[in-house]
């Protein structure tokens, strides 16, 4: 699905300071799904505010979020998944600011989990893999996964490479030798929902071998 | 109550340009993307594609691409559609409507006919 | 492209009857119980009108008698009890992948 291609960066103008973000994960437990909303400015006073959702929803008109500590959740199986959805802060029964959202354009994966690198010394590569719980999903089963990775002497040179399976092979000779490596991995949808990346995985440490020429070989 | 106001009919010869309107009201403009659907005479319907009002972004169905720019103007909660190098094949109803959801389209002008005609 | 297929071509039924439209997919539009097939109404000279979203849901405001189901590439929509004011071209829509695409359309007259 193309989407919608960008063309500048005109957000609402809020009128308060009530302005908020939220994303939604799908069957993040069992078949529950989750809507996640917090305030844009972390020093918003958040006494007496709350969360509604109201449109999109099964068999209720709207559902109110649960506060932890400064961000304000649900956990249903009554979102609809198609329409949008108005979401409001309110205060005493009356709503500061509202915004109409399609749940499934907001949707944030799981991270993914068990990232592991294993040497081939036959074939002079390294084979990454990962898993992600989103396999076993029913809605949000189709992913494009961001594998960074690093040497760890380079703080902020990360190379990526984007895949759709969970499984990329690494050539030696695009490696240093004898290094420490960090790798890691994020998801983000990639057929109908849209939404955000996922957390990075924790991060996997391997070092490559010495550069081993045997005698008569000749450098790669 | 919410509305979709489109533009006059227009008659314009091959190799010309036109530009139709859509004025929405009764809602807050940005909440909804407007898309727009080519009907040609005695025929069905055909998605030409649509713009989100709060970013300005567009998506266009692969077969329009050249032929229509959407634009949109959120002070006048107006969306406009542009036409190019005209033909006889473009003669059709065009119309603008509200996407509800991703992507069917619960509130709709009251269509525009364009008709290429030297 | 999906191309979504409608039938029948035209449909002619009495008042009170049941009138059925089936609308085929090349390929599913459906994510496990996200069904997004959406059907519309028009009647000549107007625009068209949004009957069913999301394969079953009723639009607000459009009458009982009309109710959607199927799943994958298999959809209907039906009309029970037809009535008189029901004349019109019927449309079904894909909104699962660019481009959304429409049926050909169904033409239902009541006798």
């Known amino acids: 699905e193309s989407g919608y291609a960008q063309n500048g960066d005109l957000e609402d103008a809020e009128l308060d300071d009530y302005s908020f973000s939220c994303y939604s994960q799908l069957e993040v437990n069992g078949s529950q799904h989750s809507l996640t909303c917090a305030f844009e400015d972390p020093d918003v006073n958040t006494t007496n505010l709350e969360f509604e959702i109201c449109g999109a929803l099964v068999e209720v008109k709207c559902l109110s979020f649960r506060k932890l500590q400064e961000i304000y959740f649900i956990e249903t199986k009554k979102f609809l998944l198609i329409g949008k959805s108005n979401i409001c802060v309110k205060v005493g029964g009356k709503s500061l600011t509202c915004k109409k959202i399609d749940l499934t354009t907001i949707v944030k994966p799981e991270a993914p989990f068990d990232l592991s690198v294993i040497y081939r010394e036959g074939a002079n590569d390294f084979v990454v893999t990962f898993n992600t719980s989103h396999l076993q999903k029913k809605y949000v089963k189709v992913l494009m996964h961001d594998v960074a990775y690093r040497q760890e002497k380079d703080e902020n040179k990360w190379m990526h490479v984007n895949l759709s399976s969970t499984k990329l092979t690494l050539l030696q000779r695009n490696l240093q030798p004898e290094a420490m490596y960090e790798i890691k991995v994020r998801s983000i949808p990639d057929h109908y929902f849209k939404g955000f990346w996922s957390e990075w995985s924790p991060s996997y440490y391997f070092r490559t071998p010495e550069i081993n020429n045997s005698p008569g070989e000749m450098d790669p | 109550q919410v509305q979709l106001v489109q533009s006059g009919a227009e008659v314009k010869k091959p190799g010309a340009s036109v530009k139709v309107s859509c004025k929405a009201s009764?809602?807050?403009?940005?909440?909804?993307?407007l898309h727009w659907v080519k009907q040609a005479p005695g025929q069905g319907l055909e998605w030409i594609g649509g713009i989100d009002p709060k970013t300005g972004g567009t998506a266009y169905n692969q077969k329009f691409k050249g032929k229509v720019t959407l634009t949109s103007d959120r002070s006048t909660s107006t969306v406009y559609m542009e036409l190019s190098s005209l033909r006889s094949e473009d003669t059709a109803v065009y119309y603008c409507a509200r996407s509800g959801g991703r992507w069917y389209f619960d509130v709709w002008g009251q269509g525009t006919t364009v008709t290429v005609s030297s | 492209d999906i191309v979504l297929t409608q039938s029948p071509a035209s449909l002619a039924v009495s008042p009170g009857q049941r009138a059925t439209i089936t609308c085929r997919t090349s390929?599913?539009?459906?994510?496990?119980?996200?069904?997004?097939m959406h059907w519309y109404q028009q009647k000549p000279g107007q625009p068209p009108k949004l009957l069913i979203y999301g394969a079953s849901n009723l639009e607000s405001g459009v009458p009982a008698r009309f109710s959607g189901s199927g799943s994958g590439t298999d959809f209907t929509l039906t009309i029970n009890p037809v009535e008189a004011e029901d004349t019109a071209n019927y449309y079904c829509?894909?909104?699962?992948?660019?481009?959304?695409?429409f049926g050909g359309g169904t033409k239902v007259e009541i006798k």
């Open positions: 390929e599913s539009v459906s994510i496990h119980l996200l069904h997004l």
């Open positions: 829509q894909q909104s699962i992948k660019d481009p959304y695409t």
């Open positions: 009764g809602y807050r403009f940005t909440d909804y993307e």
